[in-house]
């Protein structure tokens, strides 16, 4: 009989008797060696196993796959491509699993998947055709609807000759297959700038994470046609201020909540508009919370309590006035 | 697919409390919003108001604000309604409905308003 | 608060007709103009957002357009399950507003 799990406790398969079948083809609703599976739960957990590649005799029932805390270097193309098709993935999760490559078409054949976590790591090769599959310029959709790449930057020695940000932005946009993405987390991967046309290629996001990142402003960024965003994660960045028109684009946003703690405000004119717009908007979670990092004689005081006496830019003296 | 799923009809006298629910599952693909729109017997739909789930954070429509309260309960994925003071012209079906754009909607809950 | 006026109330078309339903709104709305179906005892559901984006799982059949203040909804070839009410909704200025529904009967 199958090792497949009963109604509702998962099933670990022996690697003995793995191995003992190896030679034979694989049994239909069979659980990999090291792996724990539930059918009544469609889920298959593989996880701090050390696997170093995807299991080739992962369940057709499949619709939960765990392959967490693993050494698999490289997803190539096909990497879930079986015969018959994992109809049923829905969600895949790969984080921690010290790759370094996705090849293009890693994710192809399957068509149910709606949500993927590629988070934690570190990703200094990911093809620009990873989540569209080809290199036509108009891709057949995705099926994703959350694609999870929090902490995915390699450590500096190991980053290829290209912006980190680049290389991301190109496997987001490929083939425009990602138009139905409603939720794209990128918390924690040292972006310096967002590229200004990453978000309007992407109109159904809902929720967007950029989270602990080093954004210094979002002076060129769009999020107008971001009709429907409802979370925009902006914490723990390096803004400085938010300009009128990002503070006009947000506000014409009728469903979005905005998070923007720990940044480094900068308190002189220039935060003036978003002082008053602070005072008038809703859309701030926590706007109470905001307080200014700079100029020193301003350290800690909260935004909401500033008036336009308190912000001033000390005056640019001509050049003949200037001291050495 | 989002599945709302919403506490059952309910009769109550004037001046009373009524406090409906709604349950959420297939919870990975939900909105933060969760709307509450009124129907009377008869007529059109009427937005009474909102909460983003997350945070707590409300929107009311004027005309039910202070009589309405939209509260969520982020660990059991339900959000909550309570009208106060019931009047004959609250009797209705309530409606919860997922999502900025309302994507989703409960089957609603008949609330009867009777002395 | 802006107020949706959806016209006609009531109409009858038979089986493959183009039907179209008007929704205008007081002020300027932008494209935030959702269309809503609901038949009888059965949940609420939205078929169109954004004045012209499908929901998923919508049949093709189902359309809008417009922009501002003038919207239309339109189904290229009546369906038998289509009998319904349907309404007009705006997101763009809190407190949303509905129009007053168009009850959609077969010939």
């Known amino acids: 009989s199958s090792p497949t799990s009963s109604a509702s406790s998962f099933s670990s398969s022996a690697p003995f008797l793995a191995s003992a079948v190896s030679a034979q083809p694989p049994l239909p609703d069979q659980c990999p060696a090291l792996c724990e599976c539930s059918e009544a739960a469609r889920t298959v957990k593989c996880v701090n196993r050390n696997l170093t590649e995807v299991p080739t005799d992962l369940p057709a029932y499949v619709r939960n796959l765990f392959l967490t805390g693993n050494q698999l270097a490289v997803l190539p193309a096909g990497a879930f491509a079986r015969r018959p098709p994992l109809a049923e993935l829905a969600a895949l999760n790969l984080s921690g699993s010290r790759l370094d490559e996705v090849r293009a078409g890693a994710f192809e054949h399957l068509p149910s998947l709606r949500q993927l976590d590629l988070s934690h790591n570190p990703l200094a090769d990911l093809s620009p055709f990873a989540f569209s599959g080809s290199n036509a310029s108009v891709s057949a959709p995705s099926p994703l609807v959350e694609l999870i790449l929090n902490h995915i930057v390699p450590p500096e020695d190991e980053r290829q000759n290209r912006s980190f940000e680049g290389m991301v932005v190109a496997a987001l946009l490929a083939g425009r297959a990602l138009q139905g993405l409603r939720r794209l987390e990128l918390a924690s991967n040292h972006f310096l700038y967002l590229p200004r046309d990453v978000l309007a290629q992407l109109p159904s996001l809902r929720h967007l994470d950029l989270s602990n990142n080093s954004l210094v402003s979002l002076t060129y960024v769009s999020f107008r046609n971001l009709t429907h965003l409802e979370s925009l994660h902006l914490e723990d960045n390096a803004l400085k201020v938010l300009h009128n028109g990002t503070l006009a684009e947000l506000q014409g946003l009728p469903h979005i909540r905005v998070f923007l703690d720990n940044n480094p405000w900068v308190c002189d004119c220039h935060m003036a508009d978003m002082v008053t717009w602070l005072k008038e908007t809703e859309v701030v979670q926590g706007k109470d919370r905001l307080t200014c990092a700079y100029p020193e004689k301003m350290r800690n005081r909260v935004l909401l309590e500033l008036n336009s006496a308190d912000l001033d830019c000390d005056p640019i003296l001509p050049p003949s006035l200037q001291t050495s | 697919e989002v599945q709302l799923v919403q506490s059952g009809a309910e009769v109550k006298k004037p001046g009373a409390t009524v406090k409906i629910s709604c349950k959420v599952s297939?919870?990975?693909?939900?909105?933060?919003?969760m709307n509450w729109v009124k129907q009377a017997p008869g007529k059109g739909l009427e937005w009474i108001g909102r909460i983003y789930r997350e945070d707590g954070h409300t929107n009311y429509n004027g005309k039910f604000k202070g009589r309405a309260t939209i509260t969520a309960d982020t660990s059991t994925t339900t959000a909550y309604m309570e009208l106060s003071s019931l009047r004959s012209e609250d009797t209705a079906v309530y409606f919860c409905a997922n999502g900025g754009a309302m994507d989703y909607w409960g089957q609603g809950t008949l609330v009867t308003v009777s002395s | 608060d802006i107020q949706m006026t959806q016209s006609p109330s009531s109409l009858s078309a038979s089986v493959g007709d183009r039907v179209t339903i008007s929704c205008r709104a007081s002020q300027d709305i932008s494209n935030y103009l959702n269309w809503y179906q609901q038949k009888p005892g059965k949940a609420v559901k939205l078929l169109i957002y954004?004045?012209?984006r499908l929901h998923s799982g919508v049949p093709s059949r189902f359309s809008g357009s417009g922009s501002g203040t003038d919207f239309t909804f339109t189904i290229s070839s009546l369906q038998p399950e289509d009998i319904a009410t349907y309404f007009c909704?705006?997101?763009?200025?809190?407190?949303?507003?509905f129009g007053g529904g168009t009850k959609l009967e077969i010939k």
């Open positions: 297939g919870y990975a693909f939900s909105s933060s919003w």
């Open positions: 954004y004045t012209s």
């Open positions: 909704q705006q997101d763009n200025t809190l407190p949303w507003t």
